[in-house]
């Protein structure tokens, strides 16, 4: 019997499909300061990949990175150059639980302050078999990390 | 460099049991899943298994549920595989192989040749 | 299980020509979260262990020459070779890793003639 590792029951929408969605919604309430979003966004370079190591229990060898995964910043007109937190924001909340690191709880933190938008949250569950459960943390850590660290080069 | 290490050769009695190991180096071993696969002489591949090194987390072929065993020594850094009641069919070489879970199979031993033979 | 088929089993040819070799998956390989196909081509020599090419379906692994390119989405995939050496005399492997058991092509052998 195959197990779906790749199933999308827990993965309503595609990460590159989320920005768009969300982002065409009502405007932010408060718009944070350029330096404000730049102080965050170099936090979350550093928490992230504090974060990845912590998983991989601090395995510093070269990762394998495919530069089309989806972007994490978004390109809208009212917040430029800002992480797209609302794509973001659902699925570190989906693994948060799993890691039980206060990184992670701060990094939500975080992406919650980059949040300007009143847009329904998108519902990600995690997935139940643990082979998936792992593939799937460690998917969305290394794309967000990755993510971030191609933006600062 | 990452290197995993097999036994070149192992040969035992039908009935018997074998257990082969695979040493890592070069990496972190928990940060990897362990992959076990069978070549047959003159055939093609058979994925056996995998083992989570951090946890000991196991996942079986169904058909080598009752023939293997998989198992994990941290301390060593050697991933084990157990194989019971052999015969002929069971000779073969079996690679270990690292898995990063995201992407793939990336590092293969060189194969341990097992011959059952009386 | 998904099962991995693979075409043709063997094929010779020149060096200097091309090569191209299918392998389909009888289910979808495309992990929705990466939008990445886990689909893996191993090449393997007489008498070696197995060794990476390509992962992602097209992603090709480090220090793999150029002339390999993997290419295909879903459930059909295909490597090709632009310009087959001598040194490329082997049997070549797709195995997904959607889906346990991960499964393996039967393989393709190239012969050089």
């Known amino acids: 019997m195959v197990s779906h590792i790749g199933s999308t029951r827990f993965a309503l929408f595609l990460l590159c499909c989320l920005g768009t969605l969300m982002f065409s919604h009502t405007g932010p309430i408060y718009q944070l300061q350029p330096k404000e979003i730049q102080a965050i966004i170099v936090e979350l370079q550093n928490l992230s990949k504090k974060l990845l190591d912590d998983y991989l229990n601090k395995e510093k060898g070269v990762q394998k990175f495919d530069s089309d995964l989806p972007s994490c910043f978004t390109s809208d007109s009212q917040a430029p150059g800002n992480i797209n937190s609302s794509a973001i924001l659902p699925y570190f909340k989906a693994i948060s639980p799993s890691l039980n690191n206060d990184k992670s709880l701060y990094i939500i933190e975080q992406l919650d302050k980059l949040n300007f938008q009143n847009a329904p949250e998108t519902e990600v569950s995690m997935p139940t078999d643990n082979f998936e459960r792992k593939r799937f943390i460690l998917t969305i850590l290394r794309w967000f990390s990755n993510c971030l660290e191609h933006r600062a080069q | 460099q990452v290197q995993l290490q097999q036994p070149g050769a192992e040969l035992v009695r039908p009935g018997a049991s074998v257990k082969l190991s695979c040493k890592a180096y070069g990496y972190t071993f928990t940060s990897y899943w362990m992959n076990w696969v069978k070549q047959r002489p003159g055939q093609g591949l058979e994925w056996i298994g995998m083992i989570d090194p951090s946890d000991s987390e196991t996942h079986y072929n169904q058909i080598f549920r009752d023939k293997a065993t998989l198992t994990i020594d941290k301390s060593s850094s050697t991933a084990y595989m157990q194989l019971s009641s052999l015969t002929s069919e069971d000779s073969a070489v079996y690679f270990c192989?690292?898995?990063?879970?995201?992407?793939?199979?990336?590092?293969w031993g060189q194969g341990t040749t097992l011959t059952v033979s009386s | 299980d998904i099962v991995m088929s693979q075409s043709p089993s063997s094929l010779a040819v020149s060096v200097g020509e091309k090569v191209t070799m299918s392998c389909k998956s009888s289910?979808?390989?495309?992990?929705?979260?990466?939008?990445?196909?886990?689909l893996a081509w191993y090449q393997q020599k007489p008498g070696q262990s197995p060794k990476l090419l390509i992962y992602?379906?097209?992603t090709r692994e480090s220090g793999v020459p150029d002339r390999f390119t993997g290419s295909g989405s879903g459930t059909d995939f295909t490597l090709t070779i632009s310009s087959v050496k001598s040194e490329d005399l082997a049997v070549y492997y797709c195995?997904?890793?959607?889906?346990?058991?991960?499964?393996f092509g039967s393989g393709t052998k190239l012969e050089i003639k």
């Open positions: 195995q997904q890793h959607y889906g346990y058991p991960f499964t």
């Open positions: 192989a690292r898995q990063d879970i995201v992407t793939t199979v990336d590092y």
């Open positions: 289910q979808s390989l495309l992990y929705s979260i990466n939008q990445k196909n886990f």
């Open positions: 992602w379906a097209s």
